[in-house]
Interface confidence: low
């Protein structure tokens, strides 16, 4: 089977504070079975910013429909983006298990937020 | 309001164990990072441990081996178990919440964990 | 690891003055430095992160600045709750994070 390679084409992404952020994320295999979580941050500060098991993420919302067995389109977008979302965003699969395991992450995605246009 | 309320220290005997609980309210607990900070007396602070939302861990070198940080998101509570305490890790033990970017924006009032014979 | 100087040990001043307090990091730490304040018998609180950006209901007498390896923690007429214990701590490696060993400012 194919190795998995997670794919965040855009190093970075700069947005108007109150628009939506389009976060980029596919990867390139279904295997390992198990989820994609995105995260802000790295190491004990990273925070979870969306699980495809857990919620609700009320200001995150799927571009595709994840749900579907052989989806391979992760990205999500961030509504109502403000300066506290800036950061660099991780894509990262996890291995299913009790619990989970940490598999393989995408490179990132740095977010900027732009002053709202008076 | 965030709060933070640990509990579980005392005196114990070099060699011996305890369990510090760190119980979490105010927040969505299972988004954050936690840690904990100790201070002995008179020092200043010192970063033990910490744990990302999804359970990632994280140690000093000087505790590696002998303490382990864990978490109940469903309890929205954070652990530290200490063994083969020194009296070196006498302090007052913080739990923190870890904000976006590594600093503590939030902290508890601390426990004493005194280590002596 | 980073290791961070903090400087000078004790400060004695008076209510009123202004106060300067320095954080030496032994590295470039990209102006990740937070810095708290702690008084006796309480938890640290945060005053300032990323070098310069206050936390939330931190007064306009507390500034901090910096960049590269040297950072200071201002406090523009010191009010007598502002006596305390000052530490920084760098937050831009987490393996470990450190703090600085703390700067003491009391009642002259």
């Known amino acids: 089977e194919e190795e998995l390679q997670i794919i965040q084409p855009d190093k970075s992404v700069s947005v108007a504070a109150g628009e939506s952020a389009i976060l980029h994320c596919t990867i390139t295999s279904l295997f390992p079975v198990g989820p994609i979580q995105w995260f802000r941050g790295a190491g004990p500060a990273r925070v979870l910013i969306y699980n495809q098991r857990q919620g609700p993420f009320p200001r995150v919302t799927t571009v595709s429909e994840t749900t579907k067995r052989e989806n391979m389109d992760f990205s999500i977008s961030i509504s109502n983006i403000t300066p506290a979302d800036a950061g660099t965003y991780y894509c990262i699969k996890f291995r299913k298990g009790s619990p989970d395991t940490e598999f393989k992450s995408g490179a990132g995605t740095e977010l900027s937020v732009r002053a709202k246009p008076s | 309001d965030v709060q933070l309320v640990e509990s579980g220290g005392g005196l114990v005997q070099p060699g011996g164990s305890l369990r510090l609980s760190c119980t979490a309210s105010g927040f969505t607990f299972r988004n954050y990072g936690m840690s904990w900070v100790r201070q002995a007396p008179g020092e200043g602070l010192e970063w033990v441990s910490a744990s990302s939302g999804s359970g990632s861990t994280y140690y000093t070198d000087s505790v590696k081996g002998r303490f382990t940080i864990s978490r109940d998101n469903s309890k929205n509570t954070l652990y530290l178990q200490m063994n083969s305490l020194r009296a070196e890790d006498t302090a007052i033990y913080y739990c923190?919440?870890?904000?976006?970017?590594?600093?503590?924006?939030?902290w508890g009032l601390g426990t004493l964990v005194t280590v002596s014979s | 690891e980073i290791v961070l100087t903090q400087s000078p040990g004790t400060l004695s001043v008076s209510p009123g003055e202004r106060v300067t307090l320095t954080c030496r990091a032994s590295q470039g730490i990209a102006g990740k430095i937070a810095w708290y304040q702690q008084k006796p018998g309480q938890a640290p609180r945060l005053l300032i992160y990323?070098?310069?950006s206050r936390a939330t209901g931190i007064p306009g007498r507390f500034s901090g600045s910096g960049s590269g390896t040297e950072f200071t923690l201002t406090i523009t007429s010191l009010q007598s709750e502002d006596f305390a214990v000052y530490y920084c701590?760098?937050?831009?490696?987490?393996?470990?994070?450190?703090f600085g060993g703390g700067t003491k400012v009391e009642i002259k």
């Open positions: 701590q760098q937050h831009y490696d987490w393996s470990p994070l450190t």
């Open positions: 923190a919440k870890v904000t976006w970017n590594n600093f503590f924006d939030y």
């Open positions: 990323d070098a310069s």
